[in-house]
């Protein structure tokens, strides 16, 4: 057959679906690879063809669209499973073609099993809620397009293993779950199960997400440099090791880049000739406030090094701060015998 633009295996779209549930999977060509949509392609006379390679096999085979109850079907650019089976796992390819044009992409589909508490190998999206911030909601994700608006599904919400009922500050409201005032105790996995009828059958959609309660923007402050500070002086003799920690606290800020860096005499350590190493460690509080520590280290400090200016800098979306370390050369202690001799007027 003629050449086909092969976009390969799109591993960015590792699709995971639960066993025995409906799944609708859009051909990624129109979402990520081509500049036109399915309608345009269809009206231009292009045909969308689906095939697959089952798990642990190399053989590409057509998808069987003649299964009982139309278990697998195609509708426009969507491949439907009603419902999935465990052995549907494999790499699926959608190919758009006519006599003169061909483009195709493959993507992995994994059908996973869940346990009685909705635990599974599924990668869970994380939804961050601000602590003590007033009413916040999460919405049951990825259920659009499964049933028409005329169908009224039932939705059951769970936290871990348990139906959410009579919780003080968490209220199920259909597709939404409302947190009246989010607390650390609300951290955990939340599952919505959407149940709907279709053609005399009942289908279920299970969606689990992780809720993480984080610091509120109301309480956010610019970075705070705890060290270096005015109370600590780094007094060293030439030849000793100089270690200066820069410890900075960052309030949690959604999508903020937290940065810490040192300058020596106004330059980045990489831009100067002295043998300096910097080690960084990061820790987080329960609400994802961050403490970054960068330790500046000079193994054998010289008297020149002890005259330099060492400044720790920090930046977040809330602002930028800097603090200089107090570094000085240790004055050698006077030699005792000489002083005594001088004191007695000896020559």
């Amino acid at each position: 057959s003629e050449r086909c633009d092969d976009w390969g295996l799109d591993t960015m779209r590792q699709i995971q679906v639960f066993e025995d549930e409906p799944a609708r999977i859009k051909c990624p060509l129109f979402e990520h690879f081509l500049k036109f949509n399915y309608s345009t392609a269809h009206s231009a006379g292009l045909t969308l063809i689906w095939y697959w390679t089952r798990q642990d096999r190399d053989l590409e085979e057509p998808i069987n669209f003649r299964l009982p109850e139309n278990r697998i079907s195609k509708e426009k650019d969507v491949l439907w499973f009603r419902p999935t089976l465990l052995n549907d796992t494999g790499n699926y390819t959608c190919m758009l073609r006519n006599t003169t044009y061909c483009s195709k992409v493959a993507f992995p589909l994994e059908v996973v099993q869940k346990d009685s508490c909705f635990n599974s190998p599924m990668k869970l999206p994380v939804h961050k809620l601000y602590i003590e911030y007033g009413i916040q909601r999460i919405t049951c994700p990825n259920v659009d397009g499964y049933f028409p608006s005329s169908v009224k599904p039932t939705i059951t919400w769970y936290m871990g293993c348990y139906k959410i009922q009579n919780f003080n500050n968490v209220i199920p409201e259909g597709m939404n779950l409302s947190f009246l005032i989010a607390l650390i105790s609300n951290n955990g996995n939340y599952t919505c199960v959407v149940t709907y009828p279709e053609n005399g059958r009942t289908f279920h959609l299970t969606r689990t997400l992780t809720v993480k309660v984080v610091g509120s923007p109301k309480n956010a402050v610019p970075p705070v440099i705890h060290s270096p500070n005015d109370h600590v002086v780094y007094e060293k003799e030439p030849g000793e090791e100089l270690l200066i920690p820069c410890t900075v606290y960052f309030s949690f800020l959604m999508d903020s880049r937290n940065e810490v860096w040192w300058t020596i005499d106004g330059k980045k350590p990489d831009d100067i000739t002295i043998d300096v190493t910097i080690n960084e460690s990061i820790s987080h509080s329960r609400t994802e406030d961050e403490t970054r520590t960068q330790i500046l280290s000079i193994k054998k400090v010289t008297s020149e090094d002890l005259k330099r200016s060492y400044v720790c800098h920090a930046r977040s979306a809330k602002g930028e701060v800097a603090k200089a370390a107090k570094v000085k050369q240790k004055v050698p202690a006077p030699r005792y015998t000489v002083e005594l001799a001088c004191g007695f007027g000896a020559t």
Partner: antibody
Framework: QVQLVQSGAEVKKPGSSVKVSCKAS????????MNWVRQAPGQGLEWMGR????????HYAQKFQGRVTLTADKSTSTAYMELSSLRSEDTAVYYC??????????WGQGTLVTVSS | DIQMTQSPSSLSASVGDRVTITCQAS??????LNWYQQKPGKAPKLLIH???GLHAGVPSRFSGSGSGTDYTLTISSLEPEDVATYYC?????????FGGGTKVEIK
């Protein structure tokens, strides 16, 4: 379509045990709960317990705790309910009922267990 | 355990009548209530889940409503094939418990 086929009627002596089977087809056996409910002659429905074949998790009604054992064989998609120390008041029709969540969506045809000396 | 009280225990109505069965829980069950239909000599069948969700394939003449402790099953227009015993069941708190049943007959 979902089908639950139960084993045949049993006549048992007091003090003995009975094991009723429920063979499932038409759905993913390991992804749903299997409940067991009984109905004494002319009486209402009584929930006994349930098992999740995927991980073997079980819940039992306090009344039957220690006397009932629920098991599942994933290889044959069959659930079992064993009731021990039988007495005459255990005479009933025993049903298995499948539920993806908590409601029992589909039921077996029932198994009559008669306890008589 | 949560007690479920169903009323009436039996009723007789004419074809085409509107029939209402009520179910009261001994404590709030947050709409976690199912209704089952059991015809003589047959296994029960799920009619309604989560108070008002019609199970697939169930005729639309059946509907459910309620909240807190009080729930209702309504048959808008009784048909001869609706002769059966109807059970409510709570699934708010384990163990699941059933009402005593309501036997519906045709006059």
């Amino acid at each position: 379509q979902v089908q639950l086929v139960q084993s045949g009627a049993e006549v048992k002596k007091p003090g003995s045990s009975v094991k009723v089977s429920c063979k499932a087809s038409g759905y993913a056996f390991t992804s749903s709960w299997m409940n067991w409910v009984r109905q004494a002659p002319g009486q209402g429905l009584e929930w006994m317990g349930r098992i999740y074949p995927g991980d073997g998790n079980t819940h039992y009604a306090q009344k039957f705790q220690g006397r009932v054992t629920l098991t599942a064989d994933k290889s044959t998609s069959t659930a079992y309910m064993e009731l021990s120390s039988l007495r005459s008041e255990d005479t009933a029709v025993y049903y298995c009922g499948e539920g993806y969540l908590d409601p029992m969506d589909y039921w077996g045809q029932g198994t009559l267990v008669t306890v008589s000396s | 355990d949560i007690q479920m009280t169903q009323s009436p225990s039996s009723l007789s109505a004419s074809v085409g009548d509107r029939v209402t069965i009520t179910c009261q829980a001994s404590q709030g069950i947050n709409n976690y209530l199912n209704w089952y239909q059991q015809k003589p000599g047959k296994a029960p069948k799920l009619l309604i889940h989560y108070t008002s969700g019609l199970h697939a394939g169930v005729p639309s003449r059946f509907s459910g409503s309620g909240s807190g402790t009080d729930y209702t099953l309504t048959i808008s227009s009784l048909e001869p094939e609706d002769v059966a015993t109807y059970y409510c069941q709570q699934y708010s708190i384990l163990p699941w418990t059933f009402g005593g049943g309501t036997k519906v007959e045709i006059k």
